[in-house]
């Protein structure tokens, strides 16, 4: 075993190339200079090293950089990134979006690993916020990324970043997440005109309050039923029949098919039957004519 620690004559690596795939693990350890490896990391990815050989190369880098790898090395890790542990990654200081992209590319098509999660966490914390370019990059690789963040984490997303969000990025979000994202979207898109604004804000409307829905009803937006069904029940309940009719436009006929489902069901129960009848859709379950409607929430507020 002792003689294996010295590099055999003529085997000292002058550069990182294909010849190294024929080296045994101990030869790689003895014959590859860590500083050479660090400067030629970009070549490693093109060479079909075994997992065992990659372990040796990682070990050499770990010895050279015990406090964590520099970004010049990290950016070129390639498949060696898959050998890193979250503990290794916590030592890194990744500031370049190009570095982040390069490492995400290695994991592309796979579920997010703990390593990638740690990398993203380090990167975002280093930047101080989830800026537009970062969000753009992350959602390109992980369409469900935004919806995997808690509402508390989403609260630190600046409104300017919302421009990077595509409708499909919100597909798996729950109502509490949309409650946080909607005001940011409203702020981000505030300078757009009516129809363009609605196209952009539509995916976020699951977090919209009643007053914003009332305002939209005045703008001939013709909201589709799929969007309407995702609205907050508490936001829909105070809307009048006339407001819902304006909000949905020609799509109002779809209410009949959804009359047993929230929020339509609960909204119907709050409307006067006479008002519902004006829609001509045969919606049933409204408050019969002549009955007094007590606003219990107002009564509680007064007492």
């Amino acid at each position: 075993e002792v003689e294996k620690t010295a590099c055999p004559s003529g085997k000292k690596a002058r550069e990182i190339d294909e010849s190294l795939i024929f080296y045994k693990k101990w030869e790689l350890e003895a014959c590859v200079d860590a500083a050479l490896l660090a400067t030629q990391m970009d070549r490693v990815n093109a060479i079909p090293f075994t997992y065992e050989q990659l372990d040796v190369l990682k070990h050499k880098l770990d010895e050279l950089y015990p406090q964590g790898y520099p970004e010049s090395v990290i950016q070129h890790l390639g498949y060696l990134f898959l050998k890193m542990s979250p503990e290794d990654i916590r030592k890194w200081n990744v500031t370049s979006l190009e570095t982040l992209k390069a490492l995400l590319e290695v994991n592309k098509g796979h579920e997010m690993s703990p390593q990638v999660a740690t990398l993203i966490d380090r990167f975002v914390k280093g930047r101080g916020q989830l800026d537009k370019d970062t969000l753009d990059t992350l959602t390109a690789f992980y369409p469900g990324y935004l919806c995997s963040l808690s509402p508390e984490e989403l609260s630190s997303v600046p409104p300017s970043s919302i421009w990077a969000v595509r409708p499909q990025d919100l597909d798996t979000c729950d109502p509490r997440q949309l409650d946080v994202l909607y005001p940011k979207a409203r702020l981000a898109f505030q300078n757009m005109n009516g129809s363009e604004y609605f196209v952009k804000i539509q995916s976020f409307l699951g977090g919209a309050p009643t007053e914003d829905l009332k305002a939209l009803s005045q703008q001939n937006v013709s909201m589709d039923l799929a969007t309407f069904m995702k609205l907050r029940t508490d936001a829909v309940l105070p809307l009048t029949v006339a407001e819902v009719q304006k909000l949905l436009g020609p799509h109002v006929e779809g209410l009949k098919a959804e009359e047993r489902h929230r929020p339509v069901r609960d909204w119907i129960l709050r409307q006067r039957q006479d008002d519902l009848d004006t829609l001509g859709l045969g919606l049933q379950g409204g408050i019969p004519n002549g009955y007094l409607v007590l606003d219990l929430s107002m009564q509680e507020a007064l007492s």
Partner: nanobody, 115 residues
Framework: EVQVVESGGGLVQAGGSLRLSCVAS????????MRWYRQAPGKQREWVAS???????HYEDFVKGRFTISRDDAKNTLYLQMDSLKPEDTAVYYC?????????WGQGTQVTVSS
Amino acid sequence: EVQVVESGGGLVQAGGSLRLSCVASGFTFSVAAMRWYRQAPGKQREWVASAFSDGNLHYEDFVKGRFTISRDDAKNTLYLQMDSLKPEDTAVYYCNAGTPSRAYWGQGTQVTVSS
């Protein structure tokens, strides 16, 4: 292969309790937003509660104070403790794993609350 399997449903009297479990595999559980949804007969599926990887928990208003969601990342398991059950809680309860890549659903577990 990703698997999401719920268990713990059953028949219980109004005012009673049940604890649902959801065991997931095939993805990194610790980075997923884990959620419970439910679907009553003839109704749409509705969100119940969420447990996020940073430890934050969120509930729909109609279950707040009665249901408690929790997760055990070491066991890849999500739980829903349901107390003070009402007949209107009768539904199929679904576990949803929202990973950064996509969402995975279980087959559901039936909860029936009799009056």
